[in-house]
């Protein structure tokens, strides 16, 4: 059966990094350059993905494999096998319309992508906020006013003056 | 075969004006969205800003009021104005093709022209 299935089909012996050639009597020719096949038995190889922009060369394009691409400094990688290089931000911002903008007071974002999100509410568990948030950095929620009760904790309760989440100005 | 071209960089003293111009083909221009991006030298690149199809355009805070980014889809040919210029502007300025309409976002099958170099300085 495997001897006669190759003679009906002579392309399932051609190996990955060949494609099967109808120009030349079937027979089993090497990929172009800037093309490649990953699998044996093709009729045509693919052609190499280019890292062009901001996108740079992870890995370059082989006979058997495609290319590989990640992205330049100040970008990273979105989507499956790096579709997508999205500009990075500081922390304390996230990408907008117009490019990289501070987080509005209240939010935070302690890396260089994503959005800037609420700073935690320590109230809603019952807790008091131990350190302010910034737009770098979450507030930091400590024991609940109870816990704090004479011999309960060592840790100093904060000053009184400012709101929960709110950042030193 | 796509083609983006840019011309009109050079050597020009702070405070200058210059326009970039970069040539398109072997795509629908009008139809695409387009941006300019930048290099400066040891640095990574910097989305500059874009134009929708529609004629909308985006700007980075820093280029915002100085820079003017323009389309002539009978020419098939990207613009940009830059006016007031700095030292931190230096840099290789590249057109490209924008196809996730996100701004600071680039697609793999994005069009890029191989940029020219603006230089600002006295």
């Known amino acids: 059966f495997e001897r006669t299935r190759s003679l009906q089909d002579p392309c399932s012996n051609c190996p990955a990094g060949t494609f099967c050639d109808n120009n030349r009597n079937q027979i089993c020719s090497p990929c172009p350059p800037n093309s490649f096949s990953s699998a044996g038995g093709q009729r045509t190889c693919d052609i190499c993905r280019q890292c062009k922009g901001v996108f740079r060369t992870r890995k370059e394009c082989s006979s058997t494999s495609n290319a590989e691409c990640d992205c330049t400094p100040g970008f990273h990688c979105l989507g499956a096998g790096c579709s997508m290089c999205e500009q990075d931000c500081k922390q304390g911002q996230e990408l907008t319309k117009k490019g990289c903008k501070d987080c509005c007071f209240g939010t935070f974002n302690d890396q260089k992508r994503g959005i800037c999100r609420p700073w935690t509410n320590c109230s809603l568990d019952g807790k008091s906020v131990l350190v302010n948030g910034t737009k770098e950095r979450d507030v930091v929620c400590g024991p609940s006013p109870a816990d704090l009760s004479p011999g309960a904790s060592s840790v100093t309760p904060p000053a009184p003056a400012r709101e929960p989440g709110h950042s030193p100005q | 075969e796509v083609q983006l071209v840019e011309s009109g960089g050079g050597l020009i003293q702070p405070g200058g004006s210059l326009r970039l111009s970069c040539a398109a083909s072997?795509?629908?221009?009008?139809?695409?969205?387009m941006s300019w991006a930048r290099q400066a030298p040891g640095k990574g690149f910097e989305w500059v800003s874009s134009i929708y199809s529609s004629g909308k355009t985006y700007y980075v805070e820093s280029v915002k009021g100085r820079f003017t980014i323009s389309r002539d889809n009978s020419k098939n040919t990207l613009y940009l104005q830059m006016n007031s210029l700095r030292a931190e502007d230096t840099a290789v300025y590249y057109c490209?093709?924008?196809?996730?309409?996100?701004?600071?976002?680039?697609?793999?099958?994005?069009?890029w022209g191989q940029g020219t170099l603006v230089t600002v300085s006295s």
């Open positions: 490209a093709r924008w196809k996730t309409l996100r701004v600071g976002v680039w697609d793999e099958s994005d069009y």
């Open positions: 072997g795509f629908t221009f009008s139809s695409s969205a």
